[in-house]
């Protein structure tokens, strides 16, 4: 006799055996595309992906025969649960193909997108290394603005229609899988059902994120105020002492990690530099050395070496002009014991820590390789992200850097070096939390249908100002898709994992430091060489997804839930110091200020009162005409008054704060140069000169088309009748 459970086991054994092979073929084809973006490799990836999808769909269909309520064995139950999830395979064939095409196209646009110099179209930059270099190192406000705006204009705008379609198809897929929407589907990764005392709902994740964010806010607000004061020194007259931070000044293309602001914000600059980039360069480190050092760290806590195949097959440097690759760092578990990292490593401290992060993924992958195919994953997505981060917390400590020769042997730790270190850590770790929370909150709202697509950008920047305290340096209308200018958005990765991982990593760090018998503050703990800490971690890693994450967390840290306390404890000395630094500064931000506010002109339009029943609707076409009319006025003014032929176009007239009762602000930039804002006084003169032409275009007059602060016209306000 054979029970249903035994039959399910037989079914799953057969599945595991066949899945291994097909998944490997698909992964390999995907790796080939990611390391060498060609049309042929896209085709191969799609073909292998189609085979894998078809197999998965068939197996998922067969798995429905096994009722979960009759399965007692948790391992069998979890595998069936995973397999009964249909994922994208619930879509019709044509929709499934379309979704695949959209995802591939978005990925290709992102990784091959170029920005060219308007004065020399042959001179072009990719994101990596070109634009990222500017955003990491440049202190030129206008150069940064050019890179920031060009990336979003070139790449974001191309992604916009694709992203709109992606949202519709992913929602359809999620609903067919019995989720409310795609955001809900993503949150399903944290769901735990039917395990007494360890259950966790998708709604609970939202609650936990919201209430932990409230607890983090005071620390972030003080970091924000301190950074703002330092940016005011670096960019005099560009920053408001009570306003948001301009989005293009924050250390990378997205303001995601503020790490590169360290040199501008270092509290005690006379102390030896704990950003060891220069030491790495001086000592001739290369990508191989960086990863070998990361490996040494893992091995020192008793975790395994990387495989021979890892070193042979990984792509650890940018292939440059040889071929185009996806340069965003990723860790790959292709199956069959084949583990790889793809990263365009640069010799910087930042990439030294990123190497630990990526190798953390591989350690997790290797640890659960013995689990059945369907349970080879992190207990939840945040766990996977946390592993390498735990190692980075130790690897970044002055103690550890000293031990590997990147800080001088006579480096002395004191209160000042401690604050320098904690500030550097906070720029990376605390600075990113509101960014992460706000991005995912926006996507959740989009998937839920709470933000109509004609308000995506409007809401994005409203939320960015309110939650993150960051403002757009130039306004963006609904032709842009700023979220998709980030890898994770255009490449279909959930993002809340980077929030949850940050909380978990400090919970884990606290527990592992106890295991390593560390004494003293948490921020000084370096777990390297502690096999006790390594063993404690490994016991969790090897479980993969075979146990609920709430249970796995409890096994390591003694609590079932994410908790922000350890993170706040870690940064406590810095928080105290920041409060003292900020005692004469405004902490928080006004969302009203923008970098372009001073040069903006407000317009009010009264169609109803001017035209009565003949009033037309103010829409995108009318706005296009308005911007064209102002561009015309600018051309006329520069030609007639300044004897300069400057070809202003409608795209140089930048509109913000459009209100439905028709008011908005606008300012004008020089053609092909977003950072060259034409002074408001010049624009006012141009408007006055062409006022009647602009009025006529809209069948309005000086009162119903009102430019606030501009005298109606150069002529008398009321023409006497001609006799």
């Amino acid at each position: 006799q054979s029970t249903i459970e035994e039959q399910a086991k037989t079914f799953l054994d057969k599945f595991n055996h066949e899945a291994e092979d097909l998944f490997y073929q698909s992964s390999l084809a995907s790796w080939n595309y990611n390391t060498n973006i060609t049309e042929e490799n896209v085709q191969n990836m799609n073909n292998a992906g189609d085979k894998w999808s078809a197999f998965l769909k068939e197996q998922s269909t067969l798995a429905q025969m096994y009722p979960l309520q009759e399965i007692q064995n948790l391992t069998v139950k979890l595998q069936l649960q995973a397999l009964q999830q249909n994922g994208s395979s619930v879509l019709s064939e044509d929709k499934s193909k379309r979704l695949n095409t959209i995802l591939n196209t978005m990925s290709t646009i992102y990784s091959t997108g170029k920005v060219c110099n308007p004065d020399n179209p042959q001179e072009c930059l990719l994101l990596e290394p070109g634009l990222n270099e500017i955003m990491a190192n440049s202190l030129d406000y206008n150069e940064r603005l050019w890179a920031w705006e060009s990336w979003r204009s070139e790449v974001g705008k191309q992604l916009r229609p694709l992203y709109e379609e992606y949202v519709v198809l992913k929602n359809e897929m999620a609903r067919a899988n019995h989720y409310e929407d795609y955001g809900d589907y993503w949150r399903g990764d944290y769901e735990v059902n039917g395990v007494d005392g360890y259950d966790y709902s998708r709604g609970q994740l939202i609650e936990d994120v919201e209430h932990t964010f409230e607890e983090i806010k005071p620390l972030y607000e003080h970091l924000h105020a301190y950074v703002r004061a330092k940016l005011m020194n670096a960019y005099p007259s560009y920053i408001s002492p009570i306003g948001c931070l301009p989005a293009h000044l924050l250390g990378d293309m997205w303001g995601r990690f503020w790490t590169n602001l360290y040199s501008l914000t270092v509290p005690f600059g006379q102390k030896p530099n704990i950003d060891v980039t220069d030491a790495m360069v001086d000592q001739a480190w290369d990508a191989q050395r960086i990863f070998k050092e990361a490996e040494k760290f893992f091995v020192s806590v008793g975790l395994p070496n990387m495989t021979q195949g890892f070193w042979e097959n990984s792509m650890l440097t940018d292939p440059g002009n040889v071929q185009k690759a996806v340069c965003h760092p990723t860790a790959w578990d292709l199956g069959k014991g084949d583990f790889r990292i793809l990263m365009c490593t640069k010799v910087t401290m930042d990439d030294f820590l990123t190497a630990h992060h990526e190798m953390g993924h591989i350690q997790y992958d290797m640890a659960y390789a013995a689990q059945p195919f369907l349970l080879r994953n992190g207990a939840n997505e945040g766990f996977h992200e946390a592993v390498g981060e735990i190692m980075s917390l130790s690897a970044a400590t002055p103690k550890h850097l000293k031990s590997i020769g990147l800080l001088s042997p006579d480096f002395q730790e004191d209160n000042e070096t401690e604050i320098n270190f904690l500030l550097k850590q906070a720029l990376t770790i605390v600075g990113t939390l509101p960014f992460t929370y706000m991005l995912e909150k926006w996507r959740w709202m989009v998937f839920k249908g709470e933000i109509p697509k004609d308000q995506w950008m409007k809401k994005w920047w409203e939320m960015k100002r309110e939650i993150v305290g960051v403002v757009e340096p130039v306004p963006h209308d609904e032709t842009y898709c700023d979220p998709a200018s980030l890898f994770h958005v255009s490449n279909d990765y959930s993002f809340i994992r980077y929030y949850t991982r940050t909380l978990y990593q400090f919970q884990f760090q606290e527990a592992l430091c106890q295991a390593a018998k560390h004494e003293g503050p948490l921020h000084k703990c370096d777990i390297s060489n502690s096999t006790e800490a390594g063993q404690k971690l490994f016991n969790m890693l090897r479980l993969g997804k075979s146990e609920p994450w709430t249970l796995a967390l409890e096994n390591v840290v003694g609590a079932k839930n994410m908790n922000v306390r350890p993170l706040l404890n870690y940064f406590e000395p810095l928080f105290t110091w920041l409060k003292d630094q900020n005692k004469n500064s405004f902490v928080g931000w006004s969302t009203d200020w923008s970098p372009y506010a001073d040069q903006s002109i407000k317009v009010r339009i009264s169609l109803k009162s001017a035209l009565g029943d003949k009033a037309y609707e103010w829409n995108d076409n009318e706005m296009y005409l308005f911007r064209s009319s102002v561009a015309y006025a600018m051309r006329q003014y520069f030609l007639k008054v300044k004897n300069q032929m400057i070809l202003f176009g409608e795209e140089d007239v930048r509109v913000a704060n459009l209100k439905p009762r028709i008011s908005f602000n606008f300012f004008v930039t020089a053609p092909k140069n977003v950072s060259d804002i034409i002074p408001r006084t010049e624009v006012e003169k141009a408007i006055r000169m062409s006022r009647s032409r602009i009025n006529d275009a809209f069948r309005l007059n000086d009162n119903s088309l009102e430019f606030l602060g501009i005298q109606p016209t150069l002529g008398p306000p009321n023409q006497p009748p001609v006799s």
């Epitope: 006799q1 054979s2 029970t3 249903i4 039959q7 399910a8 037989t10 079914f11 057969k14 599945f15 067969l62 025969m65 096994y66 009722p67 309520q69 009759e70």
Partner: nanobody, 116 residues
Framework: EVQLVESGGGLVQPGGSLRLSCAAS????????MGWFRQAPGKEREFVGA????????VYADSVKGRFTISADNSKNTAYLQMNSLKPEDTAVYYC?????????WGQGTLVTVSS
């Protein structure tokens, strides 16, 4: 090994009923489950429902809940799919499979056409 033969298909008007049978020979497990699947023209094969020879839990796809009923007659080694309130979108080739054979070799199936 188990051999399965489906029968009972045909043309039926919307709102009508039909009963399909799946005869199993070579059965060895009293505790196995019988599943019904269907494949509409140009679509992927989809799960309809499943029942255990020994009773137990019966599961259905959302699209057929409340209209279709699956049963099994242990003594006759036959499983049934009673389909009521049929709709044009139920038009498909219907197949049966068993958990005794984790990787079914799909038979000919039986064609059900719902049309006025």
């Amino acid at each position: 090994e188990v051999q399965l033969v489906e029968s009972g298909g045909g043309l039926v008007q919307p709102g009508g009923s039909l009963r399909l049978s799946c005869a199993a020979s070579g059965r060895t497990f009293s505790d196995a489950r019988m599943g019904w699947f269907r494949q509409a023209p140009g679509k992927e094969r989809e799960f309809v429902g499943a029942v255990s020879w020994s009773g137990g839990t019966t599961v259905y796809a959302d699209s057929v809940k409340g209209r279709f009923t699956i049963s099994a007659d242990n003594s006759k080694n036959t499983a049934y799919l009673q389909m009521n309130s049929l709709k044009p979108e139920d038009t498909a080739v219907y197949y049966c499979a068993t958990t005794e054979d984790p990787y079914p070799r799909w038979g000919q199936g039986t064609l059900v056409t719902v049309s006025s």
